[in-house]
Interface confidence: low
């Protein structure tokens, strides 16, 4: 009741503003999560205050709605192509300047923050939708929600609902921030067949950091973690005429690799990093398997390999290795070309002096913190000797240590090559940053994996043709299919393991279809047609930077129309709120930061939203007008 | 070379606040945590609390919530800490000092002593 | 919060001799690759000199004379040879959580 909630209100409110509910509720299926996060905040003051709505999504997130409701009154988030957004802040404000609410945070999260005037006893609630597709790694799914309300919260909740057509083998949901016996009290999870549930909707006592405070424990990540039952090798799903192709075969054996590891030892690895690198490098050379080859490279000024081919990874080589790891000492400049043309070298000499390694999985991981500045130093140049040095038949992974290194680059060679590239924090965990990038491509299962669909029924299509498979991931294939070729839809999948020729063919089910359709409706059709657009959006993006100008402007044009048509806030959209803006008649817009964008105070002052509906009219007296508030309240998931 | 440069000797009364700043420079000021640190005379190191001024994060030791503020001004390379309601106990040196990830607290202000006296 | 014992509290060391400070962490503060432990020297009426980071490596012109070992709950710092300027009290502190707590110090006076 109303007068139980003012009660209540008492202990919980900050400055006479409190939290009446903040919900997260994630619905995923077949991969494809979708989350609404809904905040109520109550101003009981008898003066306006500033409210800010703070919280943090995954950086592989697209927001796909954002609103605003006050005194009855809804402000909704408009999405259009950034040129056009981009003069309309223009005729806003004279500055050019925008005011963002998106900003990357960490390592892989985004902070979304807006700062808004609430009337005196006046309520506001917020509403912000982002989706994703959840990746398969190590062998699981993982949800994260970062949880950090500033305040104690009446109604707090975190819903999460899975379901997965070949049903769920294991679910598991931690709140690290919770001690465990308050973690075992407050999450309640289930699964049985297709369906998961987790819940975590702690009460105000629950939330308190101790029993007088009025300060919360809810600060950290919640993870749910999942993975489907995997008995049956094919995993096609169809609806709405877009399907999602799942392939993550179980029990292949593990391929013997032959790996090359180019390692920059330039002046700037001094200190932390080179100790990292080495303690990373020894442990995983103490993981490889005796079947793998494998060779170390150097690169500074100089090129040096340890061995200049590949040796087996017997205990002796492993331990030499080990000891040319400890000993090597820096060295000056950065001949990144020389490096990792050496490399390719060790590993392109399988097809002339080592026939029997050509059935192994080759892999080169380069390692670098900086710009090449020794021998060739042309980006373009470079990108072009390792491709035509590479020539398709290993991917090349690229790992780009700290800040000073041209990430984009890195990610442009890999991509050309096969690979992908990975940024290594420069952080206390480097090592196991780099023990974990490697433990992912430490167990390939099958190499040059083709999945094919009937040519005549497939209209749009997302990459279905990859280097290699590795143990714990997953590989996801979407399109679009044509009219009246549902039905007989089928996908051929031919790969090469270890010792044999991997072949299947998958075909759909469509009584088992129609069957998922009951029991999930629309939410199954609109996910399997979203993950489709994700995905192709995600591979336009990225292709985008490997190619000439004229390709890259029909690639973006493709990315911007999709973008579009399902909402999506990507590099290419922006997303502005009508009817609120700030003191400079700015409105807040919501735009996808660049992986390295500058904090919050680097893009211009905070800025204060107030809702035009809620503005003092210009008959009132200027001594009328109410002040902010010097404290800010936070409603803060970030 | 990195430095940092705290203001100088503070006298207050019992009841008063005080506060003191720790000014940066030669490295990036929003780039690395600023700590706080307080020693008391004859005594041991007793840590207050960090601000992050890229985004102005604050932690804070459970002790000295509601006893010490940290703020920073990015433009002025420059972090402070507002001790109030000040008791004869808040009499001490304070540091501030650099954090690193890699380098743990290796940097230091020479401190600023603040004695409360009536 | 972690508590960081330090023993002993204060140390007579003859010139050219050993001194060994032993730090205990109420929970361990390493990881199978580092350990969150620093030490730091301080002399009086000056701020802390950081001496070893996370655990056994060397700030960069501190002499070699200064080592430090250990992981998980136990850590020792050793100065050999002890010389004149040694004279100060050593502090071990934990990086491993907020908040970072440091031990007691111990107090080292030369012979």
């Known amino acids: 009741s109303k007068s139980s909630e003012k009660r209540q209100a008492v202990d919980t409110a900050v400055d006479g503003v409190f939290i009446r509910s903040l919900k997260v509720n994630c619905k995923v299926t077949s991969r494809f999560a979708h989350y609404v996060v809904t905040s109520q905040v109550v101003n009981t003051a008898n003066e306006a205050r500033e409210v800010a709505f703070d919280l943090e999504i995954p950086k592989t997130a697209f927001i796909s709605d954002f609103a605003v409701t006050a005194d009855g009154n809804a402000f909704i988030g408009d999405i259009k192509d950034k040129v056009t957004a981009w003069k309309q802040y223009r005729k806003a404000a004279i500055s050019g300047e925008n005011a963002g609410l998106v900003r990357a945070s960490g390592r892989t999260m985004e902070q979304f923050t807006i700062h808004l005037t609430v009337n005196p006893q006046s309520k506001v609630t917020f509403q912000l939708t982002y989706e994703e597709v959840l990746k398969r790694n190590h062998m699981q799914y993982e949800i994260v929600i970062k949880v950090k309300p500033k305040q104690l919260v009446h109604h707090f909740e975190i819903d999460v609902d899975i379901f997965e057509p070949q049903g769920i083998s294991k679910l598991d949901a931690q709140a690290s921030f919770l001690p465990k016996e308050l973690a075992a009290q407050t999450i309640k999870k289930s699964f049985s067949g297709k369906k998961g549930h987790v819940l975590f909707r702690p009460t105000v006592s629950q939330q308190q950091s101790c029993p007088t405070c009025s300060t919360s424990l809810l600060n950290g990540h919640f993870k749910v973690t999942y993975d489907v039952s995997r008995d049956k090798i094919c995993d096609l799903l169809v609806a709405n005429n877009h399907f999602a192709h799942f392939f993550a075969p179980q029990n292949l054996t593990n391929m013997n690799k032959n790996v090359v590891f180019v390692i920059d030892i330039s002046g700037s690895m001094r200190g932390q990093k080179v100790k990292q690198t080495k303690e990373a490098l020894l442990k995983i050379l103490g993981d490889m398997q005796p079947g793998d080859y494998f060779d170390l490279v150097l690169f500074g000024t100089r090129v040096q390999s340890w061995k200049g081919s590949l040796v087996q990874a017997s205990e002796a080589n492993l331990q030499a290795a080990q000891d040319f790891v400890r000993g090597f000492s820096l060295d000056e400049a950065t001949n990144l070309n020389g490096g990792l043309l050496r490399g390719i070298e060790i590993l392109n000499q399988v097809q002339e002096s080592l026939p029997e390694l050509s059935n192994h999985a080759s892999i080169l991981i380069m390692l670098t913190d900086g710009d090449p500045t020794e021998g060739v130093t042309d980006r373009s140049q470079i990108l072009k000797n390792v491709r035509n040095a590479i020539r398709g038949r290993f991917p090349l992974y690229n790992l780009g240590f700290g800040h000073n290194v041209d990430f984009n680059f890195l990610e442009v060679m890999s991509m050309e090559n096969n690979g992908r590239a990975q940024r290594i924090y420069e952080d206390h965990d480097a090592t196991q940053q780099l023990q974990g990038f490697y433990s992912q491509v430490a167990k390939p299962l099958l190499v040059d994996v083709d999945l094919q669909y009937p040519q005549d029924a497939v209209l749009a299509l997302t990459q279905n043709h990859h280097k290699q498979y590795y143990e714990g991931s997953e590989i996801v294939v979407a399109g679009r299919i044509a009219d009246n070729k549902q039905s007989s839809f089928k996908a051929d999948v031919q790969a090469h393991g270890e010792g044999q020729e991997f072949s299947i063919t998958c075909l759909v089910d469509e009584e088992e279809m129609k069957k998922l359709l009951r029991e999930r409706g629309h939410m199954l059709e609109n996910h399997v047609e979203r993950l489709w657009a994700y995905l192709t959006i995600q591979e336009l993006l990225a292709k985008r930077m490997k190619v000439d100008r004229e390709e890259r402007a029909n690639l973006s044009s493709q990315a911007l129309q999709m973008s579009l048509d399902y909402g999506f806030v990507t590099p290419l959209t922006s997303m502005s709120i009508r009817g609120m803006a700030d003191q400079d008649g700015l409105k807040p817009t919501i735009d996808k930061p660049s992986e390295d964008s500058p904090p919050l105070e680097m893009l211009g002052p905070r800025r204060t939203f107030v809702l035009s509906a809620l503005q003092p009219s210009p008959t009132h007296s200027s001594s009328n007008t109410q002040r902010l508030p010097d404290r800010v309240t936070g409603v803060d998931t970030d | 070379e990195v430095q940092l440069q705290q203001s100088g000797t503070v006298l207050a009364r019992p009841g008063a606040s005080v506060k003191m700043s720790c000014r940066a420079s030669?490295?990036?000021?929003?780039?690395?945590?600023m700590h706080w640190v307080k020693q008391r005379p004859g005594q041991g190191l007793e840590w207050i609390g960090s601000?992050?001024?890229?985004?102005?994060?604050?932690n804070y030791n459970q002790k000295f919530k509601g006893k010490a503020k940290l703020t920073a001004v990015t433009s002025a390379s420059t972090a402070y800490m507002e001790l109030s309601s000040l008791t004869n106990e808040d009499s001490a040196v304070y540091y501030c000092?650099?954090?690193?990830?890699?380098?743990?607290?290796?940097?230091w202000g020479q401190g600023t002593l603040v004695t409360v006296s009536a | 919060d972690i508590v960081m014992t330090q023993s002993p509290a204060s140390l007579a060391v003859s010139l050219g001799q050993r001194a060994t400070i032993s730090c205990r962490a109420s929970q361990s503060v390493s990881t199978s690759s580092y350990s969150y432990m620093h030490w730091y020297q301080q002399k009086p009426g000056q701020p802390p000199k950081l001496l070893i980071k996370?655990?056994?490596n060397l700030e960069s012109g501190v002499p070699a004379r200064f080592s430090g070992s250990g992981s998980g709950t136990d850590f020792t710092l050793n100065i050999h040879p002890v010389e004149e300027e040694d004279s100060a009290t050593y502090y071990c502190q934990h990086s491993w959580e907020i908040p970072p707590t440091f031990g007691g110090g111990t107090k080292l006076e030369i012979k």
């Open positions: 996370y655990a056994s």
């Open positions: 000092t650099r954090y690193g990830t890699s380098e743990g607290f290796a940097y």
């Open positions: 030669g490295y990036s000021f929003t780039s690395y945590w």
């Open positions: 601000i992050y001024p890229g985004n102005t994060d604050t």
